[in-house]
């Protein structure tokens, strides 16, 4: 039995290079540990951007990753990626694993296309 | 016999609010006048953004429209929309009409999703 993972198809990063989007899964299971991984797809290659494990007590994740943050609530993770630049424009996939207790479930979203535009530099102040 | 109009599926506006994209049609006909209309689709409604008629002599268009400009070369129009803000994010369709001489042909592209991010204001200089 697979879980369905849904995420928005498109997100625009702010002018500060911050993109936020939800990653939800269903059906909701009574799970002690949920692992969420953000992957970037370029051509046929997947690169891990960041990963974290959420628990009932630990609902704030990605503490080891300076570019990612996230909060967990029931079957929804609110993901934020920061420090993005135009070269980071691409498809970001959310992978969800229900780690414990068994049975183990895994699901992958179709990806969120994140568009990033580099801001123009502000003029120097005289 | 219809003409096929092609345009990119996605374009990002620059931080200055400028989006440029090509609109091409085929097959190419020996046409004295080609009318190009840019439409914005919101829900089921189409709104005309700008329109112009290109001729062999008049290859620069949209002179009456402050937000649009375009150049025509054979069966390709290079469109530029400026003054865009985040609220203008949406689907922009290119409509091409071969106006004269007959036969009249018309075609519509599938639309270009233009994403616009408002820039952060620069800090006041002291």
């Amino acid at each position: 039995e697979a879980i369905q993972v849904t995420q928005p198809s498109v997100v625009l990063a702010s002018s500060h290079g911050v993109a936020s989007f939800p990653c939800e899964y269903s059906p909701s299971h009574n799970t002690d540990e949920v692992r969420v991984t953000v992957l970037r797809q370029t051509n046929d290659q997947m690169t891990e951007v960041c990963a974290t494990t959420f628990t009932e007590k630990n609902t704030v994740g990605f503490l080891d990753y300076p570019f990612c943050s996230g909060t967990f609530n029931e079957s929804r993770v609110n993901l934020t990626i920061q420090g993005l630049r135009a070269v980071d424009t691409g498809l970001y996939l959310c992978k969800v694993e229900l780690m414990y207790p068994p049975p183990y479930f895994v699901g992958m979203g179709n990806g969120t296309q994140i568009y990033v535009i580099d801001p123009e530099p502000c003029p120097d102040s005289d | 016999e219809a003409i096929q109009v092609t345009q990119p599926s996605v374009v990002l506006a620059s931080s200055h609010g400028v989006a440029s994209f090509p609109c091409e049609y085929s097959p190419s006909h020996n046409t004295d006048e080609v009318r190009v209309t840019v439409l914005r689709q919101t829900n089921d409604q189409m709104t005309e953004v700008c329109a112009t008629t290109f001729t062999e002599k008049n290859t620069v268009g949209f002179l009456d429209y402050p937000f649009c400009s375009g150049t025509f070369n054979e069966s390709r129009v290079n469109l530029t929309i400026q003054g865009l803000r985040a609220v203008d994010t949406g689907l922009y369709l290119c409509k091409v009409e071969l106006m004269y001489p007959p036969p009249y042909f018309v075609g519509m592209g599938n639309g270009t999703q233009i994403y616009v991010i408002d820039p952060e204001p620069c800090p006041d200089s002291d």
Partner: antibody
Framework: EVQLVESGGGLVQPGGSLRLSCAAS????????MHWVRQAPGKGLEWVSG????????SYADSVKGRFTISRDNSKNTLYLQMNSLRAEDTAVYYC?????????????????WGQGTLVTVSS | DIQMTQSPSSLSASVGDRVTITCQAS??????LNWYQQKPGKAPKLLIY???NLETGVPSRFSGSGSGTDFTFTISSLQPEDIATYYC?????????FGQGTKVEIK
């Protein structure tokens, strides 16, 4: 009601000139390509000249090229045909006709509205 | 220019008869063939466009068929008000050209 009304026909000597007018109503004239089609007595239909909606492009049948000039005044919803160096073989009923351009149809190739015609007779 | 040849040039039929007119193009014009009706002293009127499409308001006894170079126009049951000259017109290549016309009379 969509309507086209021609005027300006009459009797003229060979080598003379005449100007035909066609007043349009009931549709967006400036968006419509307009044409002149003639019919000699007891004969068939012959396309003569056409003009684009903007007035920027024109075309002529070989038989009238260099002698006839088509024009339009979109502010007056009127089509014109200036006929110079007229010949006996130009004798005909001259019809103005609208060439239909419809987005729904993708391609069109017919005249959907015609005026009642005006007779031009070239004779000495 | 594309030449259009219509036949017959004239015909006489009785009320209720089926009437058929043919039109041949000098080259392939796909389905870009239109038919007009012209009553004496009147302007032409579009009846059929693109070979087989009936113009709005035209009675269903009129029909058209064909593609390529050979086309047919049919009046399924001739009525007195159908006395007129019928013209075909090609719309494939500019300039448009017309057939020489077929005059339809009642016996």
């Amino acid at each position: 009601e969509v309507q086209l009304v021609e005027s300006g026909g009459g009797l003229v000597q060979p080598g003379g000139s005449l100007r035909l007018s066609c007043a349009a109503s009931g549709f967006t004239f400036s968006s419509s390509s307009m044409h002149w089609v003639r019919q000699a007595p007891g004969k068939g239909l012959e396309w003569v000249s056409g003009i684009s909606g903007s007035g920027g492009s024109t075309s002529y049948a070989d038989s009238v090229k260099g002698r006839f000039t088509i024009s339009r005044d979109n502010s007056k919803n009127t089509l014109y045909l200036q006929m110079n160096s007229l010949r006996a073989e130009d004798t005909a009923v001259y019809y103005c006709a609208r060439y239909l351009m419809s987005f729904n149809l993708v391609r069109t190739s017919w005249f959907d509205v015609w005026g009642q015609g005006t007779l031009v007779t070239v004779s000495s | 220019d594309i030449q259009m040849t219509q036949s017959p040039s004239s015909l006489s039929a009785s009320v209720g008869d089926r009437v058929t007119i043919t039109c041949q193009a000098s080259q392939d014009i796909s389905n870009y063939l239109n038919w007009y009706q012209q009553k004496p002293g009147k302007a032409p009127k579009l009846l059929i466009y693109d070979a087989s499409n009936l113009e709005t308001g035209v009675p269903s006894r009129f029909s058209g068929s064909g593609s390529g170079t050979d086309f047919t126009f049919t009046i399924s049951s001739l009525q007195p008000e159908d006395i007129a000259t019928y013209y075909c017109q090609q719309g494939d290549a500019w300039p448009w050209t017309f057939g020489q016309g077929t005059k339809v009379e009642i016996k």
